[in-house]
Interface confidence: medium
């Protein structure tokens, strides 16, 4: 399923993007899944749809639930699901794990902390930043556009950082906060030729006709923050975006993990409703960085049904 978790705090603005992407010209319809009730587009409503965006201005705990978005084009429809949870504000300083965005890692050279999800909002500088609930003060901290820069990073700078900004909608202001952990790496990073962990070269993946299938391309690129690292899929040597088969999509956004200190990325290729012709395609997992490119090829084969003869 094309599903995405989103969360926010009551009485704050929350804006959610449909997990299924489409051209700006495509219409997007939103529904509350439990009741199949259409979300209005009129901005006078507290919760309303605006193209690919679903806006809670402000959010209430009762808004929690699964929302369906349908991207409609002249030739196809794509359905996505937004799993929205609105939490009550905490009285104490601690930010619970379920409100935390992905952890970012920094070093003496690179100490940017991006404010999560801010690109979805209509905000104006400056951002306010807090560490462990204390407002950041001092010349070492610089709020720059949508991120915080910390000069001369030290291990003591590790902790939970909260950004606070104001979303403006038709003259009305709504507060938004987002928190993520920041860890400090002392070791010197390095970059190496990409190593693809999965899939294996020339792997054959068994799939069932009519079912959905996922292929994951995972690669590691060195230690520490990588200036350039990417993984992606190609079909028969063609970019997914150019191949023109709406059933086959790359998962938007790449997960960066530091397994054993290594900087690794993965990209999932989702094939909906596998068809016979999909078995004829060549699926290439590509990993590239400043050193160059490595490619592992996967092919699909039909999974034989289990023989139930006694």
């Amino acid at each position: 399923k094309f599903s995405k978790q989103s969360w926010g705090l009551e009485n704050e603005a929350l804006i959610v993007r449909c997990p299924r992407q489409g051209k700006p010209s495509y219409t997007v319809d939103w529904y509350y899944s439990q009741t199949n009730k259409s979300i209005p587009t009129q901005e006078r409503n507290r919760v309303f749809a605006s193209g690919q965006l679903l806006k809670f201005l402000p959010a209430a705990v009762a808004d929690s639930g699964i929302y369906t978005c349908i991207v409609r084009s002249p030739t196809f429809n794509r359905t996505g699901y937004a799993n929205v949870t609105i939490y009550k504000k905490q009285s104490d300083c601690n930010v619970p794990d379920y409100l935390m965005y992905s952890t970012v890692s920094g070093s003496e050279k690179n100490s940017k902390i991006y404010c999560p999800t801010i690109d979805l909002y209509n905000w104006t500088a400056p951002l306010e930043w807090f560490k462990n609930c204390q407002a950041l003060q001092g010349s070492r901290y610089r709020a720059h556009k949508s991120f915080l820069v910390i000069d001369n990073v030290m291990t003591e700078d590790a902790g939970d950082y909260t950004c606070k900004f104001i979303h403006n909608e038709n003259g009305a202001n709504y507060s938004v906060t987002a928190t993520r952990s920041f860890t400090v790496k002392d070791e010197q990073g390095f970059s190496l030729f990409p190593v693809i962990g999965a899939p294996a070269q020339n792997e054959i993946k068994e799939v069932e006709i009519g079912k959905n299938a996922n292929l994951t391309c995972s690669a590691c690129f060195g230690k520490g923050t990588q200036f350039l690292a990417a993984v992606l899929w190609q079909l028969n040597g063609t970019k997914i975006t150019d191949f023109g088969e709406p059933r086959i999509q790359q998962e938007e956004g790449q997960n960066q993990s530091f397994s054993n200190g290594l900087a690794c990325l993965d990209m999932v290729l989702r094939i909906a409703d596998v068809k016979e012709e999909d078995l004829l395609l060549q699926y290439d997992c590509l990993a590239l960085n400043l050193h160059g490119l490595r490619r592992h090829t996967v092919r699909l084969s039909r999974k034989n049904p289990i023989d139930h003869h006694s």
Partner: nanobody, 121 residues
Framework: EVQLVESGGGLVQPGGSLRLSCAAS????????MGWFRQAPGKEREMVAV???????KYADSVKGRFTISADNSKNTAYLQMNSLKPEDTAVYYC???????????????WGQGTLVTVSS
């Protein structure tokens, strides 16, 4: 083999603009990543901007907000629009690419010959 040919370099005053082009030709070329690097006299070659899979862009901190990389797939061409140029942008600018021949398991970057950009009053 892929040939990359840069054009558009020249002399420009501080605060001015230039647009570099990089045309890829040779074997059937489907660029996975195209980028611009630069090398100033006495310095190491550094990455300026790259465009991955025709949609994801990355920039060096020193050029963010001033330079824009783009690509035209139909022409196998990458562009670098350089605005608000500074004297420290003076360098030889190289186009580089990684292409997509399906038989390749690992490929080094292909490089152009470079085009000189001089920012001076």
């Amino acid at each position: 083999e892929v040939q990359l040919v840069e054009s558009g370099g020249g002399l420009v005053q501080p605060g001015g603009s230039l647009r570099l082009s990089c045309a890829a030709s040779g074997r059937t070329f489907s660029s996975i990543v195209m980028g611009w690097f630069r090398q100033a006299p006495g310095k190491e070659r550094e990455m300026v901007a790259v465009i991955i899979d025709s949609r994801t862009t990355k920039y060096a901190d020193s050029v963010k907000g001033r330079f824009t990389i783009s690509a035209d797939n139909s022409k196998n061409t990458a562009y670098l629009q350089m605005n608000s140029l500074k004297p420290e942008d003076t360098a030889v600018y190289y186009c580089a690419a990684v292409g997509g021949a399906t038989t390749v398991t690992a490929s080094e970057w292909d490089w152009g010959q470079g085009t000189l950009v001089t920012v001076s009053s």
